[in-house]
């Protein structure tokens, strides 16, 4: 057993039908030594007296909230959380796995830029008595500073027959370099308390490795004369970082017909614009990713032909 | 990337291109490593980041645009004097810190040199015969530090006396392969930087 | 004490559907993850799916991807496999089973795929 | 396809020991617990070993796990006839838990 904070504690269970479970001794937080009686949660059945309580945590039942009380005056609360080992590894219900990029994936997270700011999201189709707090760090042993804000219900959708909700999370490296050459991965650990269900869930990455730029801005077109070639500019999104010849894009270039299964001409260029031939009722999409390092690429940023 | 590309001009500076070839080739190299040992601790995930130019060089610092500078995260700054007449400079004056980054960038080259001629040299003694460096690799290295042209010391090739455990270099391999793609990163940015101002 | 029974069992032809059940008693059946295993004739245990406690997360084996749904209703004390498109590979014994250090195996149901 | 490697077959004498190899890699037994099963015929197959080494209670010690590295075993000593039956490890692999990877099964037989 273990505290999560003041007054909330974690007895860890290894899970299975009929396990024989954890005993946990409880102390009221009091100078009195008589008259003490204990219930659990809204019950008014007393389990118990004395200045500790012996109980034996199995199942959810005997979590929840402990009070001690003397002649009706509530001394102090003890909440018991549960955190399940199945098998010899954490259980992982509250969170839905994205299973992108590989199995297991709980958590995402992504950068606009190299300036130490991230975002990371979730997501569960649990809508109430839910809580998740946030702490991040760079390296493990010494870590060094990361502030996150708090989680915020970010989107909610509908998949088959459940909803589905996302939560979000943005963070910043108290102290980060654009230039830098990561050595240390930044680690996320998100605490998520369902009802009296405890599991924790973390994340490890380089922020070079979680780039995604925005798409780039001002695209348009100029048509060249006596052609059907268009020269296609844009620019760097206001969002990447500076300076610009140091934090160099690629780009790639794509006119797409109407039709998805029309064949799509691609071009990759280092530059801010590039010439395309523009079919009738084609569009053409502009994407960038960092140009020495293969991350992800950005979102496609559009305009039509016409 | 196996699409057309518009390559840019190669531009007044002459490393650029070299830097270029540098990240592919390692790029390429890494890549080739992770699937050859693929049952060697050798991803990202798996592997120990180390930098073997860590106190001796210090290319990140010396190499800062200038518009970062004002960013105090930046400038961790080590003293650090480096020789300053490098024949990438030839075509423009240059400041006495571009020389010191470029003497940095040729210094973390050398470094990477010998320890990837070392590794070589016990890999070609392995029975299994696994996995060689790629020789394409070690001349863009060699292209690059010419390009660079800077007057050094040579570094002697380490030998060792006692018999390899090629497991451990294998995977020394792979840590020096991510460290060393992330140098080429860092190498190619300034490169690009330099040969825009 | 825990018990599982599995049910739904028998002979179907190649490309028709079969529905499993397996009926849990004597835990909260809502609070376990579970799994459905099958061995063939003569060959060894092969993991089919799993689903962790309100079925949102599940998980299956390749060789049963888009073909195979493991689902279940607490509510019912039943966990579900719903096969369709079956192969004659997918003739087995089929059992289900409770995650955790020390599980619980039901007796299993055959299932034939023949023509 | 399993993962998990064991022998097809071992045998022995009532009263003898013997033991069943299970070999995996780095991201199954080398990152995760290992159990064993015993499975008579026609029956399902029944928990032997779990965390590696833990018998459940009702599993005579006769029966005992290890774990190193990438691999695993189980020892039978004092081999009894009721002990022929197929016998599998199960571990997890860090990408795919929690698919469960059992091993390819050993028969072990009692010789009279």
């Known amino acids: 057993i273990w505290e999560l904070k003041k007054d909330v504690y974690v007895v860890e269970l290894d899970w299975y039908p009929d396990a024989p479970g954890e005993m946990v001794v409880l102390t009221c937080d009091t100078p009195e030594e008589d008259g003490i009686t204990w219930t659990l949660d809204q019950s008014s059945e007393v389990l118990g007296s004395g200045k500790t309580l012996t109980i034996q945590v199995k199942e959810f039942g005997d979590a929840g909230q402990y009070t001690c009380h003397k002649g009706g005056e509530v001394l102090s609360h003890s909440l018991l959380l549960l955190h399940k080992k199945e098998d010899g590894i954490w259980s992982t219900d509250i969170l839905k796995d994205q299973k992108e990029p590989k199995n297991k994936t709980f958590l995402r997270c992504e950068a606009k830029n190299y300036s130490g700011r991230f975002t990371c999201w979730w997501l569960t189709t649990i809508s109430t008595d839910l809580t998740f707090s946030v702490k991040s760090s760079r390296g493990s042993s010494d870590p060094q500073g990361v502030t996150c804000g708090a989680a915020t219900l970010s989107a909610e959708r509908v998949r088959g027959d459940n909803k589905e909700y996302e939560y979000s999370v943005e963070c910043q490296e108290d102290s980060a370099c654009p230039a830098a050459e990561e050595s240390l991965p930044i680690e996320v650990m998100v605490d998520a308390v369902h009802k009296l269900k405890y599991e924790n869930y973390t994340s490890s990455f380089f922020i070079r490795d979680i780039i995604k730029p925005d798409p780039p801005k001002n695209l348009q077109l100029k048509p060249l004369k006596n052609s059907r070639q268009v020269e296609v500019s844009w620019e760097y999104p206001d969002t990447w970082s500076t300076p610009h010849s140091y934090f160099s894009l690629t780009f790639c270039v794509q006119v797409q017909g109407k039709s998805k299964r029309e064949k799509k001409d691609r071009v990759f260029t280092d530059k801010t614009s590039a010439t395309v031939i523009c079919r009738k009722n084609a569009s053409i999409s502009v994407r960038a990713q960092d140009r020495y390092y293969s991350s992800s690429w950005s979102e496609w940023a559009s305009v039509p032909c016409s | 990337r196996n699409l057309p590309v518009a390559t840019p001009d190669p531009g007044m500076f002459p490393c650029l291109h070299h830097s270029q070839n540098l990240l592919r080739a390692v790029s390429n190299m890494l890549q080739k490593a992770r699937q050859t040992l693929e049952f060697y601790p050798c991803t990202s995930e798996e592997i120990d980041h180390e930098d073997i130019t860590k106190d001796k060089t210090s290319t990140v610092e010396a190499c800062l645009p200038l518009e970062l500078t004002k960013n105090e995260s930046c400038l961790n700054s080590r003293e650090t004097s480096f020789i300053t007449n490098g024949s990438c400079l030839a075509s423009r004056k240059t400041s006495f810190m571009m020389a010191l980054c470029l003497s940095s960038i040729y210094e973390d080259l050398k470094m990477y040199q010998v320890e990837f001629k070392t590794m070589n040299a016990k890999l070609l003694m392995d029975p299994k015969r696994q996995i060689f460096l790629d020789q394409n690799m070690l001349a863009v290295i060699d292209e690059l530090m010419q390009a660079l042209n800077f007057n050094s010391e040579t570094v002697p090739q380490k030998s060792s006396l006692e018999e390899p455990d090629f497991y451990k270099t294998k995977i020394k391999l792979c840590i020096l392969l991510h460290a060393f793609r992330i140098r080429a990163v860092t190498i190619d940015r300034v490169m690009s930087y330099l040969n825009a101002s | 004490q825990v018990q599982l029974v599995e049910s739904g069992g028998g002979v179907v032809q190649p490309g028709r559907s079969l529905r499993l059940s397996c009926a849990a008693s004597g835990f909260t059946f809502s609070s376990y993850g579970m799994h459905w295993v099958r061995q063939a004739p003569g060959k060894g245990l092969e993991w089919v799916a799993f689903?962790?406690?309100?079925?949102?997360?599940?998980y299956y084996a390749d060789s049963v991807k888009g073909r195979f749904t493991i689902s279940r209703d607490n509510s019912k004390n039943t966990l579900y496999l719903q096969m369709n498109s079956l192969r004659a590979e997918d003739t087995a014994v089929y059992y289900c089973?409770?995650?955790?250090?020390?599980?619980?195996w039901g007796q299993g149901t055959m299932v034939t795929v023949s023509s | 396809q399993s993962v998990l490697t064991q022998p097809p077959s071992v045998s022995g004498a009532p009263g003898q020991r013997v033991t069943i190899s299970c070999s995996g890699s780095r991201s199954n037994i080398g990152s995760n617990t290992v159990k064993w099963y015993q499975q008579l015929p026609g029956t399902a197959p029944k928990l032997l070993i779990y965390?590696?080494?833990q018998r459940p209670s009702g599993v005579p010690d006769r029966f005992s796990g290890s774990k190193s590295g990438t691999s695993a075993s189980l020892a039978i000593t004092g081999l009894q006839a009721e002990d022929e039956a197929d016998y599998y490890c199960q571990s997890y692999d860090r990408y795919t838990h929690p698919a469960l990877l059992f091993g390819t099964g050993t028969k072990v037989t009692v010789l009279a």
């Open positions: 965390y590696n080494d």
């Open positions: 089973k409770t995650h955790g250090s020390h599980d619980n």
């Open positions: 689903i962790r406690v309100d079925g949102s997360n599940k």
